[in-house]
């Protein structure tokens, strides 16, 4: 009997009620491999999900998130609301980054501006809600014979504002 079932191709299932003959998957179901005893229910892309690829008898539907949301998880299993750059998502909606913090993405959370002075640098370009500060050379860097060693990673004040 097992041998009969193994002959059933993708898109069908081995129907025990009909002497192991291969029956097509019913509507809104699929089997992506041969020898299946049942077909799986097709994924439905509804609510914040939209259909990227329709379900067929041999493959599941694929979903994306609707406009204003982004995918999380394997095969876009979750959708999370977008915000604008310069904002972060809270339970009460999108909130502007607090002063001294920024977010250059439509998702995620605000993080503090780099503290240039911790590296002995000066602020060359001020930070905004959407962009980090740009640190410029310290006066010592501009003096003759100053080293041009690679600067360390940007420093942040510990415990400073979000994240």
């Amino acid at each position: 009997l097992q041998d009969l079932c193994s002959n059933c191709p993708a898109g069908t299932f081995c129907d025990n009620n009909r002497s192991q003959i291969c029956s097509p998957c019913p509507p809104n179901s699929f089997s992506s491999a041969g020898g299946q005893r049942t077909c799986d229910i097709c994924r439905q892309c509804k609510g914040v999900f939209k259909t990227r690829k329709e379900c067929s008898s041999t493959s599941n539907a694929e979903c994306d998130c609707i406009s204003g949301y982004h995918c999380l998880g394997a095969e876009c299993s979750m959708c999370e609301q977008d915000c604008k750059q310069g904002q972060e998502l809270t339970k009460k909606g999108c909130k502007d980054c607090c002063f001294g913090t920024f977010n250059d993405q439509k998702r995620g959370i605000c993080r503090p501006w780099t503290n240039c002075s911790l590296d002995g640098k000066s602020v060359l370009v001020n930070g905004t809600k959407e962009r980090d500060v740009v640190c410029g050379p310290s006066p010592a860097d501009l003096s003759p014979g100053a080293s041009s060693a690679t600067p360390p990673a940007p420093a942040r004040e510990p415990g400073h504002s979000p994240q």
Epitope: M78, G108, A153, Q163
Partner: antibody, heavy 116, light 108 residues
């Protein structure tokens, strides 16, 4: 597809240093937070801290501040968790996970055993 | 930092409803997320942002969150639901994530 692959199990003695890794693939590693989560034997999940690999900004749980260091090298899409002096109480499974609130992808875990 | 308290264990007969609570000061002001962890495996999201269910998670899983308590409800519990469940929240006060202590769900 998105994957987080962690370095292998480690057996260390108290006082030794250790650095474990978490390599991301299949997504823009620089622009997603990576968190580290500890699970001691038979115990629950504990969030240790997170890093934004794009600029290596870190944020720690008060319980782990000063105990561990989280770092990242975005050029090789890898985050790290390190100890300068291990204790027996550091024996645990350590997971890296993508995200800061919703952890949608997890590494397979790195088992760290510290014993004299 | 907020502390999240869960019952260490919950038992339920197959087909019955299991409810797992997660208590914390004003947790309803933050999003709560729920993870399922089976032995030897990494955790998996079963509910995110209080009540949203990822695709691939059975419809019997649902969540709610208000006041000081978030709740994970499993209707028509099945043997395969036996696992440890953890609530978590991200707090904008300390900019940290906190997990509850975990609840072992036993299906009798």
């Amino acid at each position: 597809q998105v994957q987080l692959v962690q370095s292998g199990a480690e057996v260390k003695k108290p006082g030794e240093s250790l650095k474990i890794s978490c390599k991301g693939s299949g997504y823009s590693f620089s622009t997603y937070w990576i968190s580290w989560v500890r699970q001691m034997p038979g115990k629950g999940l504990e969030w240790m801290g997170k890093i934004y690999p794009g600029d290596s900004y870190t944020n720690y749980s008060p319980s782990f501040q000063g105990q561990v260091t989280i770092s990242a090298d975005k050029s090789i899409s890898t985050a790290y968790l390190q100890w300068s002096s291990l204790k027996a109480s550091d024996t645990a499974m350590y997971y890296c996970a993508r995200g800061y609130g919703i952890f949608d992808y997890w590494g397979q875990g790195t088992l760290v055993t510290v014993s004299s | 930092d907020i502390e999240l308290t869960q019952p260490p264990s919950v038992s339920v007969a197959p087909g019955q409803t299991a409810r797992i609570s997660c208590s914390g000061d004003n947790i309803g002001d933050q999003y709560a997320h729920w993870y399922q962890q089976k032995p030897g495996q990494a955790p998996v999201v079963v509910i995110y942002q209080d009540k949203n269910r990822p695709s691939g998670i059975p419809e019997r899983f649902s969540g709610s969150n208000s006041g000081n308590t978030a709740t994970l409800t499993i209707s028509g519990t099945q043997a395969e639901d036996e696992a440890d469940y953890y609530c978590s929240t991200y707090t904008f006060v300390g900019f940290t994530t906190v997990f509850g202590g975990g609840t072992k769900l036993t299906v009798l």
